[in-house]
């Protein structure tokens, strides 16, 4: 039975040209995390595999940095980076947990972090 929950940074905003950390945290389970995928709806950004380490998609190599931890840092943000991002935790024996983050990249300097929220 899947007992865990994914906590994410929720809805966040950042300035064009700046950087942002996408972060998820899996709690309330003793399951072993074997792999974490970071994806958009149709594009894999990065994979952190317990055995193989980090893999960054070539399309994002110049402006995606692994970490901190199992998170992902997006750099040199553009307005086109606005949208949904997903962290997918592959665990044993629980299975797969998914968290969603919505990033809005703003032209102005009024970007603020949104509130944290939980996805069961």
């Amino acid at each position: 039975m899947m007992t865990g929950t994914i906590e994410t940074t929720g809805n966040i905003s950042a300035e064009k040209g700046g950087s942002i950390i996408l972060q998820c945290h899996l709690s309330s389970t003793t399951a072993q995390v074997t792999q974490v995928n970071w994806e958009q709806q149709d594009q894999l950004l990065a994979i952190c595999n317990a055995d193989l380490g980090w893999h960054i998609s070539p399309s994002f190599k110049d402006r995606v940095a692994p970490g901190p931890g199992l998170g992902l840092t997006l750099q040199s943000l553009t307005v086109n980076d606005t949208g949904e991002y997903f962290c997918i935790y592959h665990t044993y024996p629980d299975g797969t947990y998914t968290g969603r983050i919505f990033l809005e990249v703003l032209e102005s300097s009024v970007a603020e972090h949104g509130a944290r929220f939980q996805i069961p």
């Epitope: 995928n37 149709d42 894999l44 994979i47 595999n49």
Partner: antibody, heavy 118, light 107 residues
Framework: QVQLQQSDAELVKPGASVKISCKVS????????IHWMKQRPEQGLEWIGY????????KYNEKFKGKATLTADKSSSTAYMQLNSLTSEDSAVYFC???????????WGQGTSVTVSS | DIVMTQSHKFMSTSVGDRVSITCKAS??????VAWYQQKPGQSPKLLIY???YRYTGVPDRFTGSGSGTDFTFTISSVQAEDLAVYYC?????????FGGGTKLEIK
């Protein structure tokens, strides 16, 4: 339980258009992308494209741009694919499927056979 | 586009045998590969995702392995009901592409 119910087989004339439907149930329609695949007899699977019902965004395989148009109706939880200017090369079974991020396409429709013949 | 190549179009095996189907990607796709089973007249069914993770309800005789460009799908003890075509698919980037399929025939 999750189900994707596709419309019935179609027999259409060359040059005509056809619109196939894929009605989903058992989950929130706007949570996942709906993908469309083509399979010709005794051949493999080709990915046509997807629609994300939440915002209506689409992405197409270049090969099918201009041939296929994907739409979705949130009120009826139904995805559609229109194929136009049909030729014999378009005769195939077309599948819709739900994709879960990082997990492949986990639920598929039963397939809709399209036959183009005069 | 990423090309997925399944070198064997057909494989013949006996009930109880171990069989492995290989798939090669034209570029590094990390572990973003799924395997599907399609029986005659049916829709494909997801068996394995992210190269090695068994989908819910899939019997444990089905396993997947590999990363980068080389992937393997294995049935540890073939059953009569495993007669089907097996496809690999990369879910690394669009356009998602499938291998040509390997038809498993039971002797």
């Amino acid at each position: 339980q999750v189900q994707l119910q596709q419309s019935d087989a179609e027999l259409v004339k060359p040059g005509a258009s056809v619109k196939i439907s894929c009605k989903v149930s058992g989950y929130t329609f706007t949570d996942h992308t709906i993908h469309w695949m083509k399979q010709r007899p005794e051949q493999g699977l080709e990915w046509i494209g997807y629609i994300y019902p939440r915002d209506g965004s689409t992405k197409y395989n270049e090969k099918f741009k201009g041939k296929a148009t994907l739409t979705a109706d949130k009120s009826s939880s139904t995805a559609y694919m229109q194929l136009n200017s049909l030729t014999s090369e378009d005769s195939a079974v077309y599948f819709c499927a739900r994709r879960v991020v990082a997990s492949g396409m986990d639920y598929w429709g039963q397939g809709t056979s399209v036959t183009v013949s005069s | 586009d990423i090309v997925m190549t399944q070198s064997h179009k057909f494989m013949s095996t006996s009930v109880g045998d171990r069989v492995s189907i290989t798939c090669k990607a034209s570029q590094d796709v990390s572990t973003a590969v799924a395997w599907y089973q399609q029986k005659p007249g049916q829709s494909p069914k997801l068996l394995i995702y992210s190269a090695s993770y068994r989908y819910t309800g899939v019997p444990d005789r089905f396993t997947g392995s590999g990363s980068g460009t080389d992937f393997t799908f294995t049935i540890s003890s073939v059953q009569a009901e495993d007669l089907a075509v097996y496809y690999c698919q990369q879910h690394y980037s669009t356009p998602y592409t499938f291998g040509g399929g390997t038809k498993l025939e039971i002797k």
